[in-house]
Interface confidence: low
């Protein structure tokens, strides 16, 4: 709800390059970058290679023209370059930039992959699409480290073992582990390649787990998180074709044995839903354990609306399905094609997530924002970002999403979204969130036996009503304007009945008070009112509810000439509820005890008159 769709920062890439197929927010030495995968781009650094794809870096600050430049990975220009004893590389159509991931630390490195990279050493027999990944230094300067996790000397068969593994179609980076999905291994049973950077060894997935599960595509999506314990890292792999319905597996990374051990699995619900084709590990409820979101973008009630299942971690890797999210359930939306953790977008102490539906609105695309809370996830989305509203040129907006880094320096993490069919990427900046604390002070009860006020003609029963407001928030202005409406007896009004009390202001009577306040950061401002009780009130039983509804008045944003001008703040979202505060009082019952039990006895007599 606090992303600003009015001021998107738009980066445009080369035409027909799929620029935006993958996106990644990155920072180094306090420079903010949006990194963009363009897997069908030509590379200026490898002009003789046919459309190998490229990764572009787009500087956020001091880049008024929104220019993006290709990263030089220093990979040479020629087909057939040696990459091992029985390895020759073919980079034509390798799809560099199909996936991007960042090591989660200050000087974090970047993982960029090309899952269609091929070993042509045995091309007379087989061309082997091993897939290739590259670890780019944090400063984005060449030279990085090459990973070809599926290459093994003297192995030349195509489907067997890892010959056609296509590693890197998905990638994830932890502080110590590089996780690469390899869905083509063992005749497309798939596997997960996990490199431990501390000792430079690969953790091995027990082949028996996967050998007899051909065409399940394990590794099509990967992530990692704290599933079994807050201090251990476990690896997650999606297998969207497993038994036709799709499955997701969590593996414990066992350092001692150097293997991945399965600790959890869950299945999709519908054939062909592609459950497990997108994954997101995020601690939604702040208990120190990762929860899991699993996308099924082709889940269909009518056609491919898509669905995301949310699993809450109950400890020791025991995950429990909380609910399924569907966004707006739009026709052919592919909701769940991408899922990204956004860190704490609105500064409420809980992480938030974005879910892409890139085919919604006839391929314009949309992104939905959901919020974590103590119970897991808030089922109602707080915001829908529509691609066609942000910019009518966008196509497949939401295919890729990256978040969690404050790109503009206002203390809130921002969100970057790729729209590869229009070769576009959009950075959406988060607005500061203001929390308004509202109190309505009322008497415990209203005395209706001894009127305390006068309406100019005769005495009337009345009560004092005081409203107090203050606000706080991170990086918010020192002063705000607040519009509010104080309504009396709202429960009656909501039922279309006449209210039993009314306000008296400067001799005028009114059912509600409308005011504009100037509030100062963390300082309480109060207003005092008198409300009169109508004569001959019949309902003296039900409570009288007062409601103060409020909104921000126009806010001066400051220097517009700045490249990234400050954004106006927003009020904290109330999880879909009205932004208002209520309090209630009752009419005095004049009973000795509050528990006013009737002690009535009824005696009846039947009188019959003869006709």
């Amino acid at each position: 709800y606090n992303l600003d769709p009015q001021r998107p920062v738009h980066f445009q890439g080369p035409a027909d390059s799929f620029f935006g197929y993958a996106v990644l927010e990155h920072f180094h030495d306090n420079t903010r970058w949006v990194l963009v995968g363009a897997p069908k781009a030509d590379s200026k650094y490898s002009p003789s290679v046919k459309s190998p794809g490229a990764v572009f870096k787009c500087r956020v600050h001091t880049n008024p023209d929104r220019r993006c430049t290709e990263l030089d990975m220093a990979r040479g220009k020629n087909r057939g370059t040696s990459c091992g004893k029985t390895c020759r590389e073919d980079r034509d159509d390798e799809w560099m930039g199909v996936s991007l991931a960042r090591q989660p630390k200050a000087d974090g490195r970047v993982l960029a992959c090309a899952h269609r990279w091929k070993n042509i050493y045995y091309e007379a027999d087989h061309i082997l699409p091993h897939g290739f990944c590259y670890i780019i230094p944090s400063n984005l300067q060449a030279k990085g480290r090459t990973l070809i996790p599926c290459y093994e000397e003297y192995k030349k068969k195509y489907g067997e073992e890892h010959g056609s593994c296509q590693a890197g179609i998905a990638g994830f980076f932890t502080e110590e582990l590089v996780v690469m999905g390899a869905p083509g291994s063992f005749y497309w049973a798939g596997t997960i390649k996990v490199l431990n950077l501390t000792d430079n060894t690969y953790l091995k997935l027990n082949d028996e787990v996967i050998m007899n599960r051909r065409y399940t595509y394990l590794g099509y999506a990967v992530t990692a998180g704290h599933f079994s314990h807050p201090s251990t890292i476990d690896v997650v792999g999606g297998a969207p074709q497993d038994k036709g319905i799709g499955k997701v597996y969590i593996f414990r990374a066992d350092r001692r044995s150097g293997t991945l051990i399965k600790i959890f699995q869950a299945s999709g619900k519908k054939m062909g839903s592609y459950f497990g084709s997108s994954l997101c590990a995020v601690d939604l409820n702040g208990d120190g354990l990762s929860d899991l979101l699993v996308g099924a973008p082709m889940f269909s009630e009518i056609r491919d609306e898509g669905q995301v299942t949310v699993y809450i971690n109950r400890g020791n890797g025991a995950l429990e399905e909380q609910l399924a999210l569907t966004g707006d359930g739009a026709y052919n939306a592919h909701f769940g094609e991408s899922i990204a953790s956004l860190d704490d977008l609105d500064n409420d102490g809980f992480p938030d997530v974005a879910i892409g539906a890139p085919k919604e609105d006839d391929f314009a695309g949309a992104v939905y924002i959901y919020h974590g809370d103590a119970g897991g996830i808030v089922p109602q989305y707080s915001m829908k970002l529509s691609g066609q509203k942000i910019n009518p040129v966008l196509r497949m907006f939401g295919q890729s999403i990256s978040g969690g880094i404050d790109m503009d320096g206002n203390g809130y993490p921002d969100v970057t979204v790729g729209a590869f069919m229009s070769d576009s990427v959009v950075l959406l900046r988060a607005r500061p969130v203001i929390t308004v604390d509202v109190s309505i002070f009322l008497p415990g009860s209203i005395n209706i036996t001894a009127p305390q006020c006068h309406d100019g003609q005769q005495p009337v029963n009345c009560l004092n009503v005081t409203t107090c407001f203050s606000f706080h928030g991170k990086h918010v202005p020192g002063e705000i304007g607040l519009n509010y409406v104080l309504m009396a007896d709202v429960a009656k009004k909501e039922k279309g009945q006449m209210p039993r009390v009314y306000f008296v202001l400067l001799g005028e009577t009114m059912g509600q008070v409308t005011e504009k306040l100037q509030l100062t950061y963390m300082e309480e401002t109060c207003r005092h009112y008198v409300a009169h009780v109508k004569r001959r009130v019949q309902d003296v039983i039900s409570p009288i509810v007062f409601e103060a509804a409020y909104s921000l008045s126009e806010h001066v944003t400051g220097e517009e000439e700045r490249e990234l001008p400050p954004l106006t703040p927003v009020l904290r979202w109330k999880k879909g509820q009205k932004i208002a505060q209520k309090n209630q009082t009752v009419f005095e019952r004049n009973c000795r005890s509050e528990d006013c039990a009737a002690d009535l006895q009824l005696q009846g007599k039947l009188l019959l008159s003869s006709m």
């Epitope: 206002n410 990086h475 020192g478 002063e479």
Partner: antibody
Framework: VKLQESGTKLVKPGASVRLSCKAS????????IHWVKQSPGQGLEWIGE????????NFIENFETKATLTVDRSSTTAYMQLTSLTSEDSAVYYC?????????????WGQGTTVTVSS | QIVLTQSPASLAVSLGQRATISCRAS??????????MHWYQQKPGQPPKLLIY???NLESGVPVRFSGSGSRTDFTLTIDPVEADDAATYYC?????????FGGGT
């Protein structure tokens, strides 16, 4: 955005002095005004800040009894009063404003007021 | 409070050469992926002028020969190439934690 400070002040030890900072070109009540001290040949030292909207102030510890910050919203002017002056208080005093928010940087400065304490 | 130590205290550089000024913080000034370190230039008789904000971002109107780098506790201001007009005192400043503090100047 402009911050216009008062001219040079020559005062005797033990006396008080009031410095002014007239703000223009923006909404005065929306930004805190900060004060910074620079002793002769020395570096910069942050003194404190005032919220022009509410008058709320924050100080560095050793200025809590030395300085008083006030504002006059009608004239969009901030004031700093320094009391019990000694030669240690001889310095250039600047008022400054952040770019935006409460975690940004000093984008706007006054020209400075020179205070000389001498008998 | 966070203490900022600048080095060297003074620096002589030939025109056209590179000048490098260091600023070390007694504790990290990083927060939420941002680095709350800023650089100012001050010429005699003038107030300080903002050069770099958030460690590496060039203030509008400042020549591109000025650049900032660093994170956590170690920061650098670089002027390359140096021009005669760059003769001044340079200060680093943090506002990650109250109170705001400045380096001693170079």
């Amino acid at each position: 955005v402009k911050l216009q400070e008062s001219g040079t002040k020559l005062v005797k030890p033990g006396a008080s002095v009031r410095l002014s900072c007239k703000a223009s070109g923006y909404t005065f009540t929306s930004y805190w005004i900060h004060w910074v001290k620079q002793s002769p040949g020395q570096g910069l030292e942050w003194i404190g800040e005032i919220n022009p909207s509410s008058g709320r102030t924050n100080f560095i510890e050793n200025f809590e009894t030395k300085a008083t910050l006030t504002v006059d919203r009608s004239s969009t002017t901030a004031y700093m009063q320094l009391t019990s002056l000694t030669s240690e208080d001889s310095a250039v005093y600047y008022c400054a404003r952040l770019a935006y928010g409460n975690y940004s940087w000093f984008a706007y400065w006054g020209q400075g007021t020179t205070v000389t304490v001498s008998s | 409070q966070i203490v900022l130590t600048q080095s060297p205290a003074s620096l002589a550089v030939s025109l056209g050469q590179r000048a490098t000024i260091s600023c070390r913080a007694s504790e990290t000034v990083d927060s939420y992926g941002n680095t709350f370190m800023h650089w100012y230039q001050q010429k005699p008789g003038q107030p300080p002028k903002l050069l770099i904000y958030l460690a590496s971002n060039l203030e509008s109107g400042v020549p591109v020969r000025f650049s900032g780098s660093g994170s956590r506790t170690d920061f650098t201001l670089t002027i390359d190439p140096v021009e005669a007009d760059d003769a001044a005192t340079y200060y680093c400043q943090q506002n990650n934690e109250d109170p705001y503090t400045f380096g001693g100047g170079t």
